[in-house]
């Protein structure tokens, strides 16, 4: 009660930073746990369309804001044609999935590959065929598809005509696109993600300018974009819930990403307050309206009163509970570069277990899908990616401890990524794939890295055996 009074936030997440053993959910003495994950744990791997598909203007695909951004903002990157060419080498991706033995494959649909100018009219036949073929192949292999509708590749036409996510007109257009996807693919897709990491879309797309569309310095635009992303997600959830769930019987969520942070002084109430503020300003910004009370976190409302849009009472009611599980992303994109505002002078940490505990306490112990997790290696590293294995072991150990020791309801894990590909502002200077791809080669062979062998073993053993 005292901490709540002092820190002024509605949830209970700040208990994570208390070093009182009776009060702290995480027992730091449990360094490694040799145990298995729950039976039927959902093991998967993911990719983002723009990162791996290539063929950015092939077969009638329209340009996305990222295709444009690459040509205007990123030096020494000609186009995503240099990527892993998943659009051409679908069979190779399927073989890679077979090799690892995953239960699910998380991929995103390129909106402009289906609708070149973003507006839902007649779909681009080749694009439709590609995703349909992929889904059929996954079903055949007993690999569950988890499909993301928006992983940052907004059709350029919508940016140019409406100003992209700054304009609330996009909400209905996105809903039309989602409706089409539900109609065409919903018979084969039981897990949908509306938007991948909206925080990065808003923060880097409109704040730092590091992501497409490359606008910067307008905090009001950042929060308007966030507002429209939340409302778009909510609209799509209600649409799915009302019109598609009854017969398709699937689940829908939004992937929210975050960093983790530790106080400089664990006994200092104000440092703990800053850590709470830090998490709230990144994860809570989107999680509170969707998984919480339907509104922005109180601290944000107070401190950003002149730039943060307001939800009406009706909208709060509409936003609240619009996710069937908590899809959580924890990876380098939320850490590098870290928004210094979010750091609040405290210490950034890669403690996924504590982040999961924070979610449990703040949002009433939801079912959690780790929708993106992993680290990166330098682009010069080929198949011997020992750092990636070390990081994966560390992260998976933390997830296992969260499940077994903290009773957190994690039901699935998405290793990121299946393939080396285009890594946003880092372009091709880093690699995140479990499969190595030589971007200069013609055939773009997928070569399993050490991490692929390691993950395959984890899946086979369903955890860590002694």
């Amino acid at each position: 009660i005292l901490l709540r009074a002092v820190t002024g936030f509605s949830g209970d997440g700040r208990a994570i930073w208390s070093k009182n053993p009776n009060f702290t959910p995480v027992n730091e003495s449990q360094l490694f746990l040799y145990d298995t994950f729950p039976k039927n744990f959902f093991w998967g791997i993911g990719t983002g369309a723009l990162q791996v598909e290539g063929s950015w203007k092939k077969d009638g695909k329209g340009p996305s804001i990222w295709d444009h951004f690459i040509h205007t903002h990123l030096k020494n990157v000609s186009s995503t044609n240099g990527s892993s060419d998943s659009y051409i080498f679908l069979e190779k991706d399927l073989s890679a999935l077979d090799f690892i033995g995953v239960s699910f494959y998380q991929f995103s649909i390129s909106w402009p590959r289906l609708f070149p100018d973003g507006i839902v009219t007649v779909a681009n036949a080749k694009g439709l065929q590609y995703y349909s073929t992929l889904l059929d192949a996954l079903v055949l292999r007993n690999i569950e598809p988890i499909v993301t509708l928006y992983h940052w590749d907004l059709p350029l036409a919508l940016q140019e005509k409406y100003g992209g996510w700054k304009n609330d007109t996009i909400i209905d257009i996105f809903n039309d696109y989602a409706t089409y996807c539900f109609q065409m693919f919903g018979d084969r897709v039981k897990y949908w993600i509306t938007i991948h990491n909206p925080y990065l879309v808003a923060w880097h797309g409109y704040g730092t300018g590091m992501h497409a569309p490359g606008e910067k310095g307008n905090l009001a635009a950042v929060y308007t974009v966030g507002h429209n992303l939340i409302k778009a997600h909510s609209k799509v959830w209600h649409n799915y819930n009302t019109h598609f769930r009854p017969h398709q019987k699937g689940w829908l969520s939004i992937t929210l990403g975050s960093h983790w942070i530790e106080p400089n002084r664990s006994e200092n109430t104000m440092d703990i307050f800053k850590c709470q503020q830090s998490m709230v300003s990144v994860l809570g910004w989107f999680a509170n309206p969707i998984h919480g009370d339907g509104d922005y976190p109180e601290g944000m409302r107070k401190k950003l009163f002149s730039v943060l849009p307001i939800f009406s009472e009706a909208e709060k009611h509409e936003m609240r509970g619009t996710a069937d599980f908590f899809a959580f992303s924890f990876g380098p994109n939320n850490f590098k570069p870290l928004n210094t505002m979010a750091k609040m002078g405290q210490n950034v940490s890669l403690n996924l277990r504590e982040a999961l505990n924070w979610i449990k306490l703040e949002y009433n112990n939801p079912r959690i899908l780790i929708a993106e997790n992993g680290w990166f290696t330098d682009s010069r590293v080929k198949t011997e990616d020992t750092t990636a294995i070390y990081m994966m072991k560390n992260f998976l150990s933390q997830v296992l401890q969260a499940i077994r020791l903290d009773e957190i309801r994690v039901f699935g894990y998405t290793a990121w990524s299946l393939l080396d590909g285009f890594e946003w502002q880092d372009a091709y200077t880093i690699r995140r794939g479990l499969f190595y791809v030589d971007f200069n080669s013609k055939q773009k062979e997928r070569k399993p890295k050490s991490s692929a062998h390691y993950y395959k073993q984890i899946i086979r053993e369903n955890g860590f055996s002694l």
Epitope: L219, A221, L304, M341
Partner: antibody, heavy 120, light 107 residues
Amino acid sequence: QVQLVQSGAEVKKPGASVKVSCKASGYTFTSYDIDWVRQATGQGLEWMGWMNPNGGNTGYAQKFQGRVTMTRNTSINTAYMELSSLRSEDTAIYYCARGKEFSRAEFDYWGQGTLVTVSS
Amino acid sequence: DIQMTQSPSSLSASVGDRVTFTCQASQDINIYLNWYQQKPGKAPKLLIYDVSNLETGVPSRFSGSGSGTDFTFTISSLQPEDIATYFCQQYDNLPFTFGPGTKVDLK
């Protein structure tokens, strides 16, 4: 370094209007709010309202609603506060203050103040 | 509007003294409270935000505490340059409101 420089003192008759300017330098003008706070001689501080220079959005304290207008000219990094229908109790020093970027209710830099005297 | 009261309205102390005064809000304002220092003929200066966080460059002899409706401001060892009027400000609700101030001078 960050500076807010205000226009000089004004003497106005009751019923008239006054427009005070606040020129910002040393930072990106459009990234921070400008708030206006006044202080009658020997009295406390009274917050009048805010303006976001990026879009020009404003919010005024109820007490000043209908009498105050806050504007800006981004090409010269200057904010303005106009108060109309002046009365003697509006005699005060008027300060512009910068709201922090991520906590806009904390005023980290202030102008030197502009004395407005309302007298017949 | 939220009313802010401060007590005492003025106090006299010697250099090196520990000086404490209070600010009270007419309703719960959580931790949404800032403190400012104003020297004669000058503009106010932000010292503390969110009850107890020192603004960059502010000496550590200044501190703040409290939550809800009752807040305390402390100067651990009064220095001659601390002679000023100190105002609290709430931002729990618009309009933001300031306390009437506590004037600190030397004995």
